[in-house]
Structures are given as structure tokens and as C-alpha cells.
């Protein structure tokens, strides 16, 4: 059974938060770099696996917590290891924008989980 008992953030809420932190922003988290990830391999956990390494950046903490709640809901989520491009680092804002684009596509097609 899912661990956090409060309903997980909806895809719509995640999109709203991602829009909120990226609008009018050229950079996030002082230009911190993170590993690029393949979002098709379980987008919540994949994005979290990269973003969890970002610290001292209040701007993305809510996103991190949302992804954690969504990733926690997945069956055996903790055991799934997403595909990471260990040779490619991108700025946090680029990963967040990539995630926003991907999540919007999922939302439009109604494939929420």
C-alpha cells in the first residue's frame, strides 16, 4: 500500500509547480549541474534520482518533495534504477524544463501513471 497517506500530488499540481519555478528564470540553483536522465524510464523516480543531489536550493525543494511522493507511490519504486546519462550533465533549469515538457505531454495524453 502507498506509504504517504495524503493523496499524491496530481500531475496538474506538478505541472503548476514546474511552471512556477521556471517562468522568467534563466537559471536555477545558481546554475548547478545535474545528470541528464531518460524520463521515459519512470519519469518521477528518474527525475528525482538526478534532482535529489541538488541541495541548498529552496526553489526546487517543493518539486523534489512532489517527485518523492509520486515516486514513493510506484510499485517497488525504490528498487527501480532509471537510465542515467552518466556522461552528460545539464543545468537544473534545463532538466526541470525537460521534465515540464515531458509531463505536459503525459498529461495531454491522459497517461497519468
Amino acid at each position: 500500500s502507498p506509504s504517504p497517506v495524503t493523496p499524491s500530488p496530481t500531475l496538474k499540481e506538478l505541472i503548476e509547480e514546474l511552471v512556477n519555478i521556471t517562468q522568467n528564470q534563466a537559471s536555477l540553483c545558481n546554475g548547478s549541474m545535474v545528470w541528464s536522465v531518460n524520463l521515459t524510464a519512470g519519469m518521477y523516480c528518474a527525475a528525482l534520482e538526478s534532482l535529489i543531489n541538488v541541495s541548498d536550493c529552496s526553489a526546487i525543494q517543493r518539486t523534489q518533495r512532489m517527485l518523492k511522493a509520486l515516486c514513493s507511490q510506484k510499485p517497488a519504486a525504490g528498487q527501480i534504477s532509471s537510465e542515467r546519462s552518466r556522461d552528460t550533465k545539464i543545468e537544473v533549469i534545463q532538466l526541470v524544463k525537460n521534465l515540464l515538457t515531458y509531463v505536459r505531454g503525459v498529461y495531454r495524453h491522459g497517461n497519468f501513471r
Epitope: 506509504s3 504517504p4 495524503t6 528525482l48 534520482e49 535529489i52 543531489n53 541541495s55 541548498d56 529552496s58 525543494q61 517543493r62 523534489q64 518533495r65 518523492k68 511522493a69 515516486c71 514513493s72 517497488a76 519504486a77 525504490g78 528498487q79 534504477s81
Partner: antibody, heavy 119, light 107 residues
Framework: EVQLQQSGPELVKPGASVKVSCKTS????????IYWVRQSHGESLEWIGY????????TYNQNFKDKATLTVDKSSSTAFMHLNSLTSEDSAVYFC????????????WGQGTSVTVSS | DIVLTQSQKFMSTSVGDRVSITCKAS??????VAWFQQKPGQSPKALIY???NRYTGVPDHFTGSGSGTDFTLTISNVQSEDLADYFC?????????FGAGTKLELK
């Protein structure tokens, strides 16, 4: 400097309820969640849940979903935890905390509030 | 829920020694483990986050390492003020969970 000041010790009877407060200062209250943690006598730590003062959103540990209710008062930068239907098993020290540097890693803690349930 | 096992409930040491406290997760938590120190009657104090990052003000004789399921807090050149309980925390998944703790005491 981030500070969290908790309310004083409580001695309550079985079946009663109690409300523990956590007054914060030294940072913008809506920027970070308030976490609540329980420590039974001489035992380990158990995460109860957190509340995000920004929007009032809560996430609970399933083990505490019927026991604890988390709220905030933004005007006084204070978080509250209401504990209901208390039994001797709920006798413990309850801590509030915030996580600023790393998400969900509580580095600023209140001094703890001792709750004793006894008839 | 993810279970964190601190297999040694007690560890005996002497001032100047080097000790390693271990924490094993029941599933892969990447590098999302933190370490706390707690002295009697006090609140926990955060030492390490994301497996190996020290908080500001934490002495550099505290070192965290590990990833996946196996994590270690190493205290080199143990001082008398280091005698305390040490807890690990996984912050990869909800609910957040703590290890049962390891008490560091003098031989």
C-alpha cells in the same frame, strides 16, 4: 539564525488529546516545511509527517494517519500537532524540525516536548 | 517502507580511535542517507546529508560514505564529546525512516 521553540511538557489521561506547538523564527516560515518526529523513551526516531506552511499541504507516515493532525498559523509562524485518543504507547518526546539545506533532512530542531499519558 | 538496519546497537571505542558505524537499507536509496548525532536529553544534530556532505560546523573527523544500500559514518580520532547515539535516515522515499541507532561508548 533558525530557531524552533516548542511548548512545554504535557501530562494527560488516556483517551484525551493534546496540541503541541512549535514557534519558528529566523527565516521565512513559508519557505520550508515543518517536520514532526517522535522518540519513545530510549528508542529510535519515527517520522510522523510534515506540513508545508506555503499551502497547508501535509504528508503523513501511515502509522500516524489516525493519530496526528498537523496545522500551521502563518500569522504567528507557528506549527501545531494535535494528537488524539492518547494511550500509554503515545508517551514520548515529540520534536518539530525544518530542513533547509537538503530536502527532508531535518537540520534545525526544536528542543522537544515530552508527552506523558498516564491515569 | 524502507528499513534501515544499524546492526551494532553499541560500539566501544577509546579516545583517538577510528570507528565506523554502518547502516544498511532494505532497498536502493541511491545516496539519500543522512546521519544524526544525539546526546542524552538533547535534540538530534544533523551531521551528514546525501551520504557524504557535512553540514557547516561539523568537524571534519566525521566522514560519510556509501551509496545504494550500504552506508558508513566514520569518526576518526574519536573525542570524548563524540560519545553519543548515532542514527541514519533515508530521505529517498516516503515515509522517511531512521535506523535504530548505534550508541558510541568508551571501552
Amino acid at each position: 539564525e533558525v530557531q524552533l521553540q516548542q511548548s512545554g511538557p504535557e501530562l494527560v489521561k488516556p483517551g484525551a488529546s493534546v496540541k503541541v506547538s512549535c514557534k519558528t523564527s529566523g527565516y521565512s516560515f513559508t519557505d520550508y516545511p515543518i517536520y514532526w518526529v517522535r522518540q519513545s523513551h530510549g528508542e529510535s526516531l519515527e517520522w510522523i509527517g510534515y506540513i508545508d506552511p506555503y499551502n497547508g499541504g501535509t504528508t503523513y507516515n501511515q502509522n500516524f494517519k489516525d493519530k496526528a493532525t498537523l496545522t500551521v498559523d502563518k500569522s504567528s509562524s507557528t506549527a501545531f500537532m494535535h494528537l488524539n485518543s492518547l494511550t500509554s504507547e503515545d508517551s514520548a518526546v515529540y520534536f518539530c524540525a525544518t530542513a533547509v539545506v537538503a530536502t527532508d533532512v531535518m537540520e534545525n530542531w526544536g528542543q522537544g516536548t515530552s508527552v506523558t499519558v498516564s491515569s | 517502507d524502507i528499513v534501515l538496519t544499524q546492526s551494532q546497537k553499541f560500539m566501544s571505542t577509546s579516545v583517538g580511535d577510528r570507528v565506523s558505524i554502518t547502516c544498511k537499507a532494505s532497498q536502493n536509496v541511491r545516496n539519500a542517507v543522512a546521519w544524526f548525532q544525539q546526546k542524552p536529553g538533547q535534540s538530534p544534530k544533523a551531521l551528514i546529508y546525501l551520504a557524504s556532505n557535512r553540514y557547516t560546523g561539523v568537524p571534519d573527523h566525521f566522514t560519510g560514505s556509501g551509496s545504494g544500500t550500504d552506508f558508513t559514518l566514520t569518526i576518526s580520532n574519536v573525542q570524548s564529546e563524540d560519545l553519543a547515539d548515532y542514527f541514519c535516515l533515508q530521505h529517498w522515499n516516503y515515509p522517511l525512516t531512521f535506523g535504530a541507532g548505534t550508541k558510541l561508548e568508551l571501552k
